[in-house]
């Protein structure tokens, strides 16, 4: 089942996705699409990278992390209720059927009406409650049978909701990571 993330209307949503390049600058193409990951590619592509850089993007979707180091987490700016749904992060590893696919569910909640102004929150994300680690270390590492050189490391945190933009960097240490090479 999809990992669920939450954001409020008007905020920026953050959907984590990572891989570890085999060597600096040796990038693997990645696509983000709206809708569950299909057999190939991404459906309704909202952003794409190639071996060099981001080569397809639209106005509200961007990679704010260091994608050259494998942080291909998607930021959706100024979200609306229509942004709710499943998003696919696809790491397009060379070779037949080698792609890694992650389905992330984004739930957009109506903006809270607050009586007093509060500090702006840039990122909000909820993590599933059945998590296996309390820190930022790997919870488990499993070797993919068909890809002996690629490990899938799943990292999570127990926080139900990130409510402060200064936690964005912590968030980048969370999520799913593919190591290549």
């Amino acid at each position: 089942s999809e990992v669920e993330y939450r954001a409020e209307v008007g905020q920026n949503a953050y959907l984590p996705c990572f891989y570890t390049p085999a060597a600096p600058g040796n990038l693997v193409p990645v696509c983000w699409g709206k809708g569950a990951c299909p057999v190939f590619e991404c459906g309704n592509v909202v952003l794409r990278t190639d071996e060099r850089d981001v080569n397809y993007w639209t106005s509200r979707y961007w990679l704010n992390g260091d994608f050259r180091k494998g942080d291909v987490s998607l930021t959706i700016e100024n979200v609306t209720l229509a942004d709710s749904g499943i998003y696919c992060c696809r790491i397009q590893i060379p070779g037949i059927m080698n792609d890694e696919k992650f389905n992330l569910k984004l739930v957009i909640k109506p903006a809270k009406v607050t009586p007093a102004p509060t500090r702006q929150r840039d990122f909000t994300a909820a993590f599933p409650r059945m998590l296996t680690t309390r820190g930022h270390g790997p919870a488990e590492t499993q070797t993919l049978g068909s890809l002996p050189d690629i490990n899938l490391t799943q990292i999570s945190t127990l926080a139900n909701e990130l409510r402060d933009s200064r936690l964005a960097n912590d968030l980048r240490d969370s999520g799913a990571t593919i190591r290549i090479g």
């Epitope: 909202v46 080569n55 993007w57 639209t58 106005s59």
Partner: antibody, heavy 118, light 110 residues
Framework: QVQLQESGPGLVKPSQTLSLTCTVS??????????WTWIRQTPGKGLEWVGA???????YYSPSLKSRTSISRDTSKNQFTLQLSSVTPEDTGVYYC??????????WGQGTQVTVSS | QSALTQPPSVSGTLGKTVTISCAGT?????????VSWYQQLPGTAPKLLIY???KRASGIPDRFSGSKSGNTASLSISGLQSEDEADYYC??????????FGGGTKLTVL
């Protein structure tokens, strides 16, 4: 508000190279995520995307024009330039520069008429 | 022949709604949320109406709306006004970093 202004010769001889410049005001051509584009409107083919240069300097070209097209930029002058080589009368038309935050749409300049004739 | 297919002309009655279609493929309209619509009056540059399928450009009234279903995009104009008489073009990103346009639709307001 970003403003675009195309400039260049209105008349070019066949087999020569067409060179057009787009001067950008009200914003920098290196602004993150911006895409700076050339589009033309010809009597024969209607609106046709020619190519683009991204905020990063990376260029993209129409497959049908790629062999004849070059797009470059001068960040000190906040300009980007289209060069189209080996022109023929079929390249006659209005050439527009345009911009947007990504690939989702275009805000256009006013356009400049180019005629290819001997 | 244009890469995206639009009807050459449509007509609508003052105050009513008209819809212009734009047919593409899974490599452009169907695969990406980068459909845009433009209005061009005689002798002027195209003006952005809709970007990214359904987002109105700044200053565009909500009489103009965009949508997409499968490989076909649509522009709807409600409460037709005489000044809406113009040529309308669709465009879409296409795989491999290319952009394609429709052939244009001439809208006549009756």
């Amino acid at each position: 508000q970003v403003q675009l202004q195309e400039s260049g010769p209105g008349l070019v001889k066949p087999s020569q190279t067409l060179s057009l410049t787009c001067t950008v005001s009200g914003g920098s051509i290196t602004t993150n995520r911006y895409l700076w584009t050339w589009i033309r409107q010809t009597p024969g083919k209607g609106l046709e995307w020619v190519g683009a240069i991204a905020y990063s300097g990376r260029t993209y070209y129409s497959p049908s024009l790629k062999s004849r097209t070059s797009i470059s930029r001068d960040t000190s002058k906040n300009q980007f330039t289209l060069q189209l080589s080996s022109v023929t009368p079929e390249d006659t038309g209005v050439y527009y520069c345009a911009h947007f935050t990504g690939w989702g749409g275009y805000y256009w300049g006013q356009g400049t008429q180019v005629t290819v004739s001997s | 022949q244009s890469a995206l297919t639009q009807p050459p002309s449509v007509s609508g009655t003052l105050g009513k709604t008209v819809t212009i279609s734009c047919a593409g493929t899974s490599s452009d309209i169907g695969g990406y949320n980068s459909v845009s619509w433009y209005q061009q009056l005689p002798g002027t540059a195209p003006k952005l109406l809709i970007y990214e399928v359904n987002k109105r450009a700044s200053g565009i009234p909500d009489r103009f709306s965009g949508s997409k279903s499968g490989n076909t995009a649509s522009l709807s104009i409600s409460g037709l006004q005489s000044e809406d008489e113009a040529d309308y073009y669709c465009a879409s990103y296409r795989s491999a970093n290319n952009v394609v346009f429709g052939g244009g639709t001439k809208l006549t307001v009756l």
